[in-house]
Interface confidence: low
Amino acid sequence: EAHKSEIAHRYNDLGEQHFKGLVLIAFSQYLQKCSYDEHAKLVQEVTDFAKTCVADESAANCDKSLHTLFGDKLCAIPNLRENYGELADCCTKQEPERNECFLQHKDDNPSLPPFERPEAEAMCTSFKENPTTFMGHYLHEVARRHPYFYAPELLYYAEQYNEILTQCCAEADKESCLTPKLDGVKEKALVSSVRQRMKCSSMQKFGERAFKAWAVARLSQTFPNADFAEITKLATDLTKVNKECCHGDLLECADDRAELAKYMCENQATISSKLQTCCDKPLLKKAHCLSEVEHDTMPADLPAIAADFVEDQEVCKNYAEAKDVFLGTFLYEYSRRHPDYSVSLLLRLAKKYEATLEKCCAEANPPACYGTVLAEFQPLVEEPKNLVKTNCDLYEKLGEYGFQNAILVRYTQKAPQVSTPTLVEAARNLGRVGTKCCTLPEDQRLPCVEDYLSAILNRVCLLHEKTPVSEHVTKCCSGSLVERRPCFSALTVDETYVPKEFKAETFTFHSDICTLPEKEKQIKKQTALAELVKHKPKATAEQLKTVMDDFAQFLDTCCKAADKDTCFSTEGPNLVTRCKDALA
């Protein structure tokens, strides 16, 4: 129903703590350069205003839309043009154009330093002094670096963070309690970020219907006992929630997500037998738990998919009458039978089925034409299955770091024009798929691998869009989301690339590398590896392995030397010479 004051309505629904957290996230995602203190001041002003509207919905300005209220706040920030350049032009526009303009200026790769975690003692001190401010800093720092982070999920991660600190700061050895736990939260949050960005990309580039198709497939896999009507209702509601979050309407998004969780828990009987554990949890944990709940047991008596979609004499009639429903039903029926497929694969199959019906239903004898459609799915299914097998075998042989290096070589050959930092980031992320997915049971590997790779490649596309340099990447990023991963996999060495000339300084290292954390050392070595491939795109695996082993040996030797600086300055040039010779 309509409310006199939208801001009062959301404040009442969400409660002060979540309301303030979401407003802070919203401001941090829009204005990514502002400090925490600047945003905290705005949040307090908005919250105070919301409270006046709760007390009296007819008070001045309480009837204004949230976009108007938030936009006016952002546009009142001093020195907006100096700090944000053309984003300030958004403030000359009226709603809804102003909000659209803010959205277009969100930066997926802001030039902010990496979020450094303070050491345990310092963290615990500031957490104990003021837990609210501490968590506010966390929300601000994550949100500004990830401007499309799913806001209600970020509140969940902040809650996790809070619980870990409460527990570990009471222990004697704070460091060894905090580090693994916070690393775990960070890893999950980063995966959540790329997954949500993919959803927003789907929404932005291909509209709500594309996202809804994704949701139907995903929900049908998870809830195979729910009927099509139920799945569609859930998919529709989930689409609305994601549309709101992707569009910056974070209060509405969080409120609607809570409503959806409530609906699911009230209707477990028609959705899934696996929801009870999630439904017993408090709100943020409940919604998070539902989003990754295990698949329900598939009904035992499902008829063969061919009955309704190939053998039925009315296939073309049914398709012509209600294309969207018929294809939706196909996607639902196929997905609920295949929890072992990725959503991307299921959408490719649905697309193939649609193309087949479009072609065949226009012919003289449609059944003869579409009769082989399920057999034609085979190559589409085999391709990602082979991808998983090949890559998981390689991961098991090389381990995560070696696997990342193999991917880095492969992708640098496919798109050598892409900047080395982007290639290294992408390869490191793509390489994590091994640790994340290859250790899972066989039937869970494919969905894990392909849907994760698709999300990472979406980030590659977003970064490349800002400064397009590779025709290969442009080609793969221009197609539909579900075709991206197969397109990237099929790319080979870019023959148009003119190799980079060999620069000794690129491969010159100093003793400061010895004190870097392991992760940073790996990045330095992987940066050198990418540069080697850019110099010799057709170098063999053997040649590259020789050079990288030599490089590792060099680092090991010099970092153990009594006089590190001398070792680096004398052995470094020798290493460079050996590298050139090995690649000649």
């Epitope: 509601d237 609305k240 009458e321 429903v325």
Partner: nanobody, 123 residues
């Protein structure tokens, strides 16, 4: 301008029947799925039934299955709701709605709405 005009509402005894009609104008009727929603006093609007563009697919809420029947006449640009075995809890304003795309007819998917017709079922 798109218009959906409902008619056929009124007062009826429990156990009785009514037939609601919804006449559409200003849109290509056969390109739209149609639905009936209802809103009882003090309650949220709920979906009751919907029908696909050609009439081959229907959706019924559990509360009306076996009692209500939806049909459409694309030549007449009209959708009908036959309501039998009416109960006092069926009392509500009934709204006709049109959707360019149809899945199962959640309110969010419908593009055009009528003004509603009141159905009162007395016990």
């Amino acid at each position: 301008e798109v218009q959906l005009v409902e008619s056929g509402g009124g007062l009826v005894q429990a156990g009785g029947s009514l037939r609601l009609s919804c006449a559409a104008s200003g849109l290509t009727f056969s390109s739209y799925a149609m639905g009936w929603f209802r809103q009882a006093p003090g309650k949220e609007r709920e979906r009751v039934v919907s029908i696909s563009r050609g009439g081959g697919y229907t959706y019924y809420a559990d509360s009306v299955k076996g009692r209500f029947t939806i049909s459409r006449d694309n030549a007449e640009n009209t959708v009908y709701l036959q309501m039998n075995s009416l109960k006092p809890e069926d009392t509500a304003v009934y709204y006709c709605a049109a959707a360019r795309y149809w899945a199962t007819g959640s309110e969010y998917e419908f593009d055009y709405w009528g003004q509603g017709t009141l159905v009162t079922v007395s016990s």
